[in-house]
């Protein structure tokens, strides 16, 4: 009976999310393998988040708008492990907007989700950021490694969206 009611709850939750995401990919997790964590198909999952690589070329504002239409934000990178996971799926000759910007050019960098900007957990390429006119951050491959670079916000780039996993 308990299992039956849990299944019914799950199904109704799935139907609710179906309006926004036509298809979800879910995995069982938790100590009793009773919880399901889901990401929209074809997003990828890492820890408690889902990620989507957008290959359409857009300005930073449009890229954030595009992520938000999908219920997400431009990616906020919190750890080296997270960055390493994300970069597995990126093309080395492309650049991708991050959810990091310096709106006034005062070198006050801020994440789109208001996560505090911690200088000790940043992955800028050597010599970057280097220009107060370049107020948005990208991740790209340079000198044999992935790192961040400041760029002009209005020049179209690919982007990475991130959202919390859906638990049902």
């Amino acid at each position: 009976n308990f299992m039956y009611s849990k299944t019914v709850k799950r199904l109704s939750k799935l139907q609710e999310y179906q309006q926004y995401y036509p298809s979800l990919t879910c995995v069982m997790e938790g100590k009793d393998m009773e919880d399901w964590s889901c990401c929209p198909t074809p997003w990828t999952s890492f820890q408690s988040s889902c990620y989507f690589i957008s290959t359409v070329m857009q300005s930073w504002t449009k890229s954030q708008n595009n992520c938000s239409v999908m219920g997400a934000d431009l990616v906020v990178i919190n750890t080296k492990e997270e960055q390493d996971f994300i970069t597995q799926n990126l093309k080395i000759n492309s650049a991708y907007f991050l959810g990091l910007s310096d709106p006034k050019g005062w070198r006050h960098w801020q994440w789109v989700d208001q996560t505090p900007y911690n200088k000790n957990v940043t992955f800028w390429h050597s010599g970057e950021p280097n220009s107060p006119d370049e107020r948005c951050a990208i991740i790209n491959f340079r000198s044999e490694e992935w790192g961040w670079n400041d760029v002009h916000c209005h020049v179209p780039q690919k982007s990475i969206c991130k959202m919390k996993k859906i638990y049902i």
């Epitope: 359409v56 300005s59 002009h152 916000c153 209005h154 020049v155």
Partner: antibody, heavy 120, light 107 residues
Framework: DVQLQESGPGLVKPSQSLSLTCSVT?????????WNWIRQFPGNKLECMGY???????NYNPSLKDRISITRDTSKNQFFLKLNSVTTEDTATYYC?????????????WGHGTLVTVSA | DIQMTQSPVSLSASVGETVTITCRAS??????LAWYQQKQGKSPQLLVY???SLVDGVPSRFSGSGSGTQYSLKINSLQPEDFGSYYC?????????FGGGTKLEIK
Amino acid sequence: DVQLQESGPGLVKPSQSLSLTCSVTGYSITSGYYWNWIRQFPGNKLECMGYITYDGSNNYNPSLKDRISITRDTSKNQFFLKLNSVTTEDTATYYCARGGDYDDGGFAYWGHGTLVTVSA
Amino acid sequence: DIQMTQSPVSLSASVGETVTITCRASGNIHNYLAWYQQKQGKSPQLLVYNAKSLVDGVPSRFSGSGSGTQYSLKINSLQPEDFGSYYCQHFWIIPYTFGGGTKLEIK
């Protein structure tokens, strides 16, 4: 004030390459924005061909990808269009324009355009 | 690519009249739409960006509106200098495509 000016041959033979130059004054092409080539066919249809960004990266219209190359000479503040294997279908007025104004909401600065005819 | 369908293809009107040109996108372009005016033998001039924002110096008789996939440019009290061709262009995702144009002629 930002000004753009196209130049190049007005007549190109089929199967040859079309080469055009856009000279920019009033703004350094390495300081910002992205720098486009746009063409307008005889029936007035407009097409974005591709661009080069202030930091030198390119993006091309997929319909032209195998034939197009956009490069620049930063010392002369110029950028260039090369279109290979042209046919009569490439007859058009070619414009250069700056992209990225109004948070990339419209092309505010255009050259006057140069007519290129492809004919034997 | 997002396709832009503009109508009408041509339009005849008199000085003082009000005209409306419409543009339909094949997908949601989230208000990232520009309108241009082009006179014979000249390059296009940007009039409106982000669907409804007028470029500095453009007369207030021009106005843009719309959302989603449907947009329009309205010109109130037509002046002789308003005659020419008008084009819409979306700025949502590369490549930015143009509408086919509307030729506005004096009746």
